[in-house]
């Protein structure tokens, strides 16, 4: 599934509306390992990879395409 990297750059959003903090309004139990799709405003967050949202930490995470590394998959992996 590529390299998964995480970044603390977030405003606590889970569902895509600036005024919402969806994690505070859902009844689900927050267990590590639960990923959700990143809200729409993160559409271009991952440069060379797929964005997914870490529900337990409310942070965007990038699953990098092969050959790319970095918090936002912005760097070429020279060892690839």
């Amino acid at each position: 599934d590529g390299n998964s990297t995480r970044s603390p750059e977030t405003n606590g959003l889970l569902c895509g509306d600036p005024e919402e903090n969806c994690a505070a309004t859902t009844t689900q139990s927050k267990r590590k390992g639960h990923f959700s799709r990143c809200p729409k405003q993160y559409k271009h967050y991952c440069i060379k990879g797929r964005c997914r949202f870490v529900v337990a930490e409310q942070t965007p995470s990038c699953v990098c395409d092969e050959g790319y590394i970095g918090a936002r998959c912005e760097r070429v992996d020279l060892f690839y």
Epitope: L14, C15, G16, D17, E20, C22, T25, T26, Q28, S29, R31, G33, H34, F35, S36, R37, K40, Q41, R50, R52, F53, V55
Partner: antibody, heavy 120, light 106 residues
Framework: EVQLLESGGGLVQPGGSLRLSCAAS????????MHWVRQAPGKGLEWVSS????????FYADSVKGRFTISRDNSKNTLYLQMNSLRAEDTAVYYC?????????????WGQGTLVTVSS | DIELTQPPSVSVSPGQTASITCSGD??????VHWYQQKPGQAPVLVIY???DRPSGIPERFSGSNSGNTATLTISGTQAEDEADYYC?????????FGGGTKLTVL
């Protein structure tokens, strides 16, 4: 071929229980979140429940919360919906659907549906 | 909770363009997906992520989403496009469907 096949529907009395199954084939079941969606006769689509890829988190519509339980067995490539305290308004065709990826995307594969009729 | 509102019915002549709307508060900030359902059949995804088309779906199907309205457009509508169409989005961690639109090809 990617396929979802529901089973377990039928006629049940109000207050009764039923367990639906959805057998998945043709893809890596454990990579995908799964969902149940229902459609009452002549009505539109209504989301029922969702479960993440490993079964650790589940989500329900208010209309079924506390009565229905979604689960999955990744070793059997099967999704389940345990329905208790059934009501007449639960009468519908129940579809299982695959999430494109881990959770929160779109429903790219649907089963053919299984009819649940709640009536005395 | 977000509500998605669709017109109950839309009529179009063969070869003409059909537009089906899906309205909801600030829906442009969410991804919207569209499903086609023919009588007695399961729904089929025809547009995802506002405007992307799955493989196997004809090019005449397109979508847009901005502000409070998402739109499914069928250009050069054919008789086989007659069906019910549903929009869908996520609200918090729940799935929301529009009420559906019956497209009639006259």
């Amino acid at each position: 071929e990617v396929q979802l096949l529901e089973s377990g529907g039928g006629l049940v009395q109000p207050g009764g229980s039923l367990r639906l199954s959805c057998a998945a084939s043709g893809f890596t079941f454990s990579d995908h979140a799964m969902h149940w969606v229902r459609q009452a006769p002549g009505k539109g689509l209504e989301w029922v429940s969702s479960i993440v890829y490993d079964g650790s988190n589940t989500f329900y519509a208010d209309s079924v919360k506390g009565r229905f339980t979604i689960s999955r067995d990744n070793s059997k490539n099967t999704l389940y919906l345990q329905m208790n305290s059934l009501r007449a308004e639960d009468t519908a065709v129940y579809y299982c659907a695959r999430d494109y990826l881990d959770f929160g995307y779109y429903f790219d594969v649907w089963g053919q549906g299984t009819l649940v009729t709640v009536s005395s | 909770d977000i509500e998605l509102t669709q017109p109950p019915s839309v009529s179009v002549s063969p070869g003409q363009t059909a537009s089906i709307t899906c309205s909801g508060d600030k829906i442009g900030k969410k991804y919207v997906h569209w499903y086609q359902q023919k009588p007695g059949q399961a729904p089929v995804l025809v547009i995802y992520d506002d405007s992307d088309r799955p493989s196997g779906i004809p090019e005449r199907f397109s979508g847009s989403n901005s502000g409070n309205t998402a739109t499914l457009t069928i250009s050069g509508t054919q008789a086989e496009d007659e069906a019910d169409y549903y929009c869908q989005a996520w609200d918090m961690q729940s799935v929301v469907f529009g009420g559906g639109t019956k497209l009639t090809v006259l």
